[in-house]
């Protein structure tokens, strides 16, 4: 959010310096031009750090449904299918923006909110703490 | 995104059935109560499918800066530090919501946009296509 000099074609705003409350058009524009942008959909099973996806729904949030990753194992899966506990499966987390209805149940008033979601898992070498 | 019976404490809206344009408060509420929400910040180096982070900036977008992951190798890093090309490093992608200034340069008018971002990488077993 940056204050940009007013353009005559812009909707009017009470706060001329820095908009705190803005108008947002909820007709989503999808910039993913690829016919199939979500090719990662089977990685959760094929990864050496596989994960399950859990459905999280909150009607007061937009989007109301978010699928969260939870790593299946503490360790990582080896080629023979066994779990190697010398390695760690860890969630890759990302902070995302969502809209939260505010006041609650209001259909046309939201507040931006940052939430941390786990998108998938990756296999990492553990940090070994040596005791002196 | 639902038409909810108007609550007397709600801001007024032109569209009573289904809000297309809504008011959004840009004072971000951060629901990440953890003191260090970016725990995964060193995973990009320790992962068997390590990645680099590239800065993507767009002043017409909110947030204007997004960090994108690019996998360092086609294969995955073994315990000895060599790359195993029998496995694949692949990006974990997620569709996220951003705000796009619309009309361009307007400080207080946005449109929701979905973009696909690579959050990190994971090591997967390749799909082998057998030729008959």
């Amino acid at each position: 959010g940056i204050a940009i000099p007013r353009n005559s074609g812009c909707p009017n705003s009470e706060d001329k310096n820095f908009p705190r409350t803005v108008m947002v058009n909820l007709n989503i524009h999808n910039r993913n031009t690829s016919t199939n942008p979500k090719r990662s959909s089977d990685y959760y099973n094929r990864s050496t750090s596989p994960w399950n996806l859990h459905r999280n729904e909150d009607p007061e949030r937009y989007p109301s449904v978010i699928w969260e990753a939870k790593c299946r194992h503490l360790g990582c899966v080896k080629a023979d299918g066994n779990v190697d506990y010398h390695m760690n499966s860890v969630p890759i987390q990302q902070e995302i923006l969502v809209l939260r209805r505010e006041p609650r149940h209001c259909p046309n008033s939201f507040r931006l909110e940052k939430i941390l979601v786990s998108v998938g898992c990756t296999c990492v070498t553990p940090i070994v703490h040596h005791v002196a | 995104g639902i038409a909810i019976p108007r609550n007397s404490g709600c801001p007024n809206s032109e569209d009573k059935n289904f809000p297309r344009t809504v008011m959004v408060n840009l004072n971000i509420h951060n629901r990440n109560t953890s003191t260090n929400p970016k725990r995964s910040s060193d995973y990009y180096n320790r992962s068997t499918s390590p990645w680099n982070l590239h800065r993507n900036e767009d002043p017409e977008r909110y947030p204007s800066v997004i960090w994108e992951a690019k996998c360092r190798h086609l294969g995955c890093v073994k315990a000895d530090g060599n790359v195993d090309y029998h496995m694949n490093s692949v990006p974990i992608q997620q569709e996220i919501l951003v705000l796009r200034r619309e009309p361009r340069h307007c400080p207080n008018s946005f449109r929701l946009e979905k973009i696909l971002v690579s959050v990190g990488c994971t090591c997967v077993t390749p799909i082998v296509h057998h030729v008959a």
Epitope: L26, N27, I28, N30, P37, K38, S41, D42, Y44, N45, L53, H54, R55, E57, P59, Y62, P63, S64, V65, W67 | G1, I2, A3, I4, P5, F18, E95, L112, K114
Partner: antibody, heavy 123, light 106 residues
């Protein structure tokens, strides 16, 4: 026009498996979950589970956990519901229905349904 | 699992009459959806999020309620309203439906 077109009726023996397909058109497949609901003859509706075609995420009614498998192929915009170890009380019409993940003009409810697939389990 | 109990199971009604169908949940739910189903047809979304009419639903229908008690009301019944109506919750897993209320026109 939004359409969910399901595969044709099936007759199966007890212990067998059935796989019902649901081809979606008229909307972006990965913007909506696909839920599966069944209805035994003369009975009410029973929720089986949900799949998000974008992430592959699934959630099942515990009653069907381990026996039902939901999958989706986003290259053909088709969702599938496989039910194994069929019993006579699995005889029902199986419906697929979509549920919005994003705003659009959707009511966050099962707003479009397939025509249903009758699965008959009989020896 | 949340059990939804509809009342009545069956109702025979005269055109123009006011009809009320109730749906009682065994635990509190956020919202209730209602579906209409006619013989040999798929269910149709009728009322979503407790009180919002789905596209094409006549204004004689309304929905209300909160917590454990929800209601679908038809102000002045018409012949085309003969169908089975189901309530549905999705506040907790598994999502559940009521047993249905069959409306017949006298």
């Amino acid at each position: 026009e939004v359409q969910l077109v399901q595969s044709g009726a099936e007759v199966k023996k007890p212990g067998a498996s059935v796989k019902v397909s649901c081809k979606a058109s008229g909307y972006t497949f990965t913007d909506y979950e696909v839920h599966w609901v069944r209805q035994a003859p003369g009975q009410g509706l029973e929720w089986i589970g949900v799949i998000d075609p974008g992430t592959g995420g699934v959630a099942y009614n515990q009653k069907f956990e381990g026996r039902a498998t939901l999958t989706a192929d986003d290259s053909t915009n088709t969702a599938y519901m496989e039910l194994r170890s069929l019993r006579s009380d699995d005889t029902a019409v199986y419906y697929c229905t979509r549920y919005s993940l994003f705003y659009g003009s959707s009511p966050y409810a099962m707003d479009y349904w397939g025509q249903g697939t009758l699965v008959t389990v009989s020896s | 699992e949340i059990v939804l109990t509809q009342s009545p199971d069956f109702q025979s009604v005269t055109p123009k009459e006011k009809v009320t169908i109730t749906c009682s949940a065994s635990s509190s739910v956020n919202y209730m959806h209602w579906f209409q189903q006619k013989p040999d047809q798929s269910p149709k979304l009728w009322i979503y999020r407790t009180s919002n009419l789905a596209s094409g639903v006549p204004s004689r229908f309304s929905g209300s309620g909160s917590g454990t008690d929800y209601t679908l009301t038809i102000n002045s019944l018409e012949a085309e309203d003969a169908a089975t109506y189901y309530c549905q919750q999705r506040s907790s897993y598994p999502w559940t439906f009521g047993q249905g209320t069959k409306l017949e026109i006298k």
